[in-house]
Interface confidence: low
């Protein structure tokens, strides 16, 4: 079954390297590397590094799946994050004494800043840092729907953990929906799973930056660790380019 | 960008056809087509056709995803089904007056008949036929865990429907677990999603063959339509062959 | 996407999914598969004409990457992307069997 | 699976994932990507030696299908199976950007 054809490994590697050069530029829709003339000296800003690291960590936690890739997904996605509205905001007032849930509100205008048009959004994740916990709990995520109603989004079984861990929920559809509506405050509810006959419906999970137990909301000292939306979107200028060439092959 | 190489389409098709000949035989681990000497005359038995149809319908409802295929998944899987224990069985007695749930019990020995060894099971689906309904409801599936406790498995938002429709839940892990335990009766609970502050926790969904409303359990006339487990497993003789060659490349 | 919707309705010369129906009796001379009588297997065919070279005018070929070499392979190849399984019914002795064969139907192709 | 675990620790001649680290500065002459400095791109290489022919002794080659031509292609090809994305940081003018590039890292290969 041998092919009796010797392979020039170095040539293959060189071809692959050159192909990658084109691949990266094409994914960014750049005809040539960007000019570095205006790049400020010194290290990268801390916020940028944090964003890069959380994107990298997300990749490491994902399974490597060869999903069929729609044309728009070939191109690079800009990654931004939108922090939850500050816990001191009055909007949290009426949620304080609810033991089965914690609430996270977001300002849609901040989201629109990062993603101006709904179709540009390719993925939105709600990221929460869960503090260490010795109990197992089944939790659910809801989306604020109308004045006093909530729409179920998903659930998770949280096992005990010795260290803080990041939880991630895919909320792409929800965020796209928000972008299609007017500006305002929108939110999520993170709840204990309440079964039909269960008595203890208390949420035993603590989330960094929002758990009511933490006096003075120390979590906000580490602003990076309070709940946020991680957004992946096609930049507007790249999308316009993509749209104009969509029907060519 | 043309390759300037004419392609003999007929040759390619012939090669593909021959490759498929080998592919099908290899997936069934057959060195040659099976003898047809003992095949009974007449059409296929109705139960076999029903099983074939429900497998085919499942395929049509799935998205075509190129999942990375573990070696064992390359080979063909035999499809069988195990019906729920008859509704007249005394085991259902204590579940009669519960309005938030319906219950389905299965005999593990029936499952073991179809899948003698736990590792042979590649997929198990719980199939329920939901009757037409004008209401939307969020439902949950639980597995019987110990005497009086239930383990959450998954949920579904059921929208109104004019026609009966089949619901399918992946219960591979649960059935594998049952196969690892001794024989006996095991079961599932299909419940309304009870939210922490909800008052109406009644299950409004009717399932063919088990909904308590249906007097005299007319659903069992169409035995095919009562809840069942659809099992996909590697036949024992094929698995032994596979095991012996696993570490060769 | 280079799927049946696009490829079957166009005369695409490059990588695309091509129609192929397999009739078990006619094409393979088999009578032992009782259901189905045949199936749309399809196949992938066509060049992935990506120009690579250090002195290539990038602006000209960058737009071709997405279709012709999205994976930046050293020598891209037209291969199946989305596949579907095929259930069959056949007899072993007197016993009818329903079996599912994975990845039998090609629904779309890609340059990889 | 023809993944990094198997391929990097064996001397497999047939289709397998091969190691390749790209250093943006050294290999591509680029200083504009600030993070990461490089990445393990890897690539797929090796024959998919499937014998097809009407008069082939099936019993001999059937066992080879699983590895060498699981998709029953007319001319199987060694291509990426599992891929991973790569996040990068670069500047546009004075503004730092974090972007994610899909399907950049080859984790496993297959004959397709």
């Amino acid at each position: 079954l041998s092919t009796c054809k010797t392979i020039d490994m170095e040539l293959v590697k060189r071809k692959r390297i050159e192909a990658i050069r084109g691949q990266i530029l094409s994914k960014l829709r750049l005809a040539s590397p960007p000019s570095q003339g205006e790049v400020p000296p010194g290290p990268l800003p801390e916020a940028v590094l944090a964003l890069y690291n959380s994107t990298r960590d997300r990749v490491a936690g994902e399974s490597a799946d060869p999903e069929p890739e729609p044309e728009a997904d070939y191109y690079a996605k800009e990654v931004t994050r939108v922090l939850m509205v500050d816990r001191n905001n009055a909007i949290y007032e009426k949620t304080k004494d609810i033991s089965h849930s914690i609430y996270m509100f977001f300002n849609t205008s901040d989201i629109r800043e990062a993603v101006p048009e709904p179709p540009l959004l390719s993925r939105a994740e709600l990221r929460l840092q869960r503090l260490k916990s010795s109990v197992e709990q089944h939790v659910e995520l809801y989306q604020k729907y109308s004045n006093n109603s909530w729409r179920y989004l998903g659930n998770r079984l949280l096992t005990p953990t010795d260290t803080p861990e990041w939880l991630s929920f895919d909320v792409t559809g929800v965020v796209r929906q928000w972008l299609n509506q007017g500006d305002g405050i929108q939110g999520f509810r993170f709840s204990a799973h309440c079964s039909c006959d269960s008595k203890d419906n208390k949420l035993h999970v603590e989330i960094n930056g929002i758990s009511p137990k933490r006096r003075g909301d120390l979590g906000t000292i580490h602003d990076m660790n309070r709940p946020f939306l991680l957004l992946m979107a096609t930049p507007l200028e790249r999308a316009q380019h993509l749209h104009s060439s969509r029907h060519r092959r | 960008l043309s390759t300037c190489k004419t392609i003999d389409m007929e040759l390619v098709k012939r090669k593909r056809i021959e490759a498929i000949r080998g592919q099908i035989l290899s997936k069934l681990r057959l060195a040659s087509p099976p003898s047809q000497g003992e095949v009974p005359p007449g059409p296929l038995p109705e139960a076999v056709l029903a099983l074939y149809n429900s497998t085919r319908d499942r395929v049509a409802g799935e998205s075509a995803d190129p999942e990375p295929e573990p070696e064992a998944d390359y080979y063909a899987k035999e499809v069988t089904r195990v019906l729920m224990v008859d509704r007249n069985n005394a085991i259902y007695e204590k579940t009669k007056d519960i309005s938030h749930s319906i219950y389905m019990f299965f005999n593990t020995s029936d499952i073991r008949e179809a899948v003698p060894e736990p590792p042979l099971l590649s997929r198990a689906e719980l199939r329920l036929q939901r009757l037409k309904s004008s209401v939307e409801q969020h439902v949950e599936l639980y597995q019987k865990y110990s005497n009086n406790s239930w383990r959450y498995l998954g949920n579904r938002l059921l929208t109104p429907t004019d026609t009966p429709e089949w619901l399918s839940f992946d219960v591979t892990g649960v059935v594998r677990q049952w196969l690892n335990q001794g024989d006996g009766i095991q079961g599932f609970r299909f419940s309304a999603h009870c939210s922490c502050d909800s008052k109406d926790n009644k299950l409004h969904v009717e399932i063919n063959g088990i909904s308590p409303k249906r007097r005299g359990d007319l659903g069992t006339i169409h035995d095919m339509n009562r809840p069942f487990l659809l099992l996909m497993a590697t036949p024992l003789e094929r698995a032994q062959h596979l095991h012996s060659s696993r570490h060769r490349r | 996407a280079l799927d049946t919707n696009y490829c079957f309705s166009s005369t695409e010369k490059n990588c695309c999914v091509r129609q192929l129906y397999i009739d078990f009796r006619k094409d393979l001379g088999w009578k032992w598969i009782h259901e189905p009588k045949g199936y749309h297997a399809n196949f992938c065919l066509g060049p992935c004409p990506y120009i690579w070279s250090l002195d290539t005018q990038y602006s000209k070929v960058l737009a071709l990457y997405n279709q012709h070499n999205p994976g930046a392979s050293a020598s891209p190849c037209c291969v199946p992307q989305a596949l579907e399984p095929l259930p069959i019914v056949y007899y072993v002795g007197r016993k009818p069997k329903v079996e599912q064969l994975s990845n039998m139907i090609v629904r779309s192709c890609k340059c990889s | 699976a023809l993944d990094t675990n198997y391929c990097f620790s064996s001397t497999e001649k047939n289709c397998c994932v091969r190691q390749l680290y790209i250093d943006f500065r050294k290999d591509l002459g680029w200083k504009w990507i600030h993070e990461p400095k490089g990445y393990h791109a890897n690539f797929c290489l090796g024959p998919c030696p499937y014998i097809w022919s009407l008069d082939t002794q099936y019993s001999k080659v059937l066992a080879l299908y699983n590895q060498h031509n699981p998709g029953a292609s007319a001319s199987p090809c060694c291509v990426p199976q599992a891929l991973e994305p790569l996040p990068i940081v670069y500047y546009v003018g004075r503004k730092p950007k974090v972007e994610q590039l899909s399907n950049m890292i080859v984790r496993s290969c297959k004959c397709s």
Epitope: N107, S109, P116, I185 | - | - | -
Partner: antibody, heavy 120, light 112 residues
């Protein structure tokens, strides 16, 4: 020190146009949403329009929608309000104001105002 | 009519405590949106006093405090001084209006 300085006001006839500018300094202009607020003689404050930090989202009060256009040039740290089809009820002092935090609609810095008079 | 209702005028003597109220609805104050208080001294631009219902802006004396309950917001000035004579406006985002932001009609505070 944060500073906002409006200019471009004046006397204009009904149906006429004016373009107001607001020069910003002392803060990273491109990080904040900014607003125009007006005050008719002897009356209270009335919100006119808002533009987001990157200039992507723009919002207008019903009274000016379709006639006024707000824009910004982050390179020049300048905010603009193009006013067309002016009416006598648009007579007011026009203030530009910056958000305390991005898109919070809380104005922690205001300009001194520029007078717009619409009269024949 | 303003969506946020304030008394048009109030008065108090030096050293006294006065409370200015602002009544809204569930689409503004009661909806939990940022509520602010502004002071406008005669002939000058408005100045932010209180943000997010109860937080003093920098440089604002602690004689000024804000609170909120349901659809009602209050600004309290303790130890009233002559320089506190001014117009006071509440302002809040309103989700029910296409206008987006609303101010109260203003309260003219006179120090006797």
């Amino acid at each position: 020190e944060v500073q906002l300085v409006e200019s471009g006001g004046g006397l204009v006839q009904p149906g006429g146009s004016l373009r107001l500018s607001c020069a910003a300094s002392g803060f990273t202009f491109s990080n904040y949403g900014v607003h125009w607020v007006r005050q008719a003689p002897g009356k209270g404050l009335e919100w006119v329009s808002h533009i987001s930090a990157a200039g992507i989202s723009r919002y207008y009060a019903d009274a000016v929608k379709g006639r006024f256009t707000m824009s910004r040039d982050n390179g020049k740290n300048t905010l603009y309000l193009q006013m067309n089809g002016l009416k006598s009820e648009d007579t007011a002092v026009y203030y530009c104001a910056k958000d305390r935090i991005r898109s919070s609609y809380e104005y922690d810095s205001w300009g001194q105002g520029t007078q717009v008079t619409v009269s024949s | 009519l303003p969506v946020l209702t304030q008394l048009s005028s109030m008065s108090g003597s030096p050293g006294q405590t006065v409370t200015i109220t602002c009544t809204g609805s569930s689409s503004n104050i009661g909806g939990g949106y940022y509520l602010s208080w502004y002071q406008q001294l005669p002939g000058t631009a408005p100045k932010l006093l209180i943000y997010n219902a109860n937080n003093r802006a920098s440089g604002v004396p602690n004689r000024f405090s804000g609170s909120k309950s349901g659809n009602l917001a209050s600004l309290t000035i303790t130890g009233l001084q002559a320089e506190d004579e001014a117009d006071y406006y509440c302002g809040c985002y309103d989700s029910s209006l296409s206008t987006g932001y609303v101010f109260g009609g203003g309260t003219k505070l006179t120090v006797l």
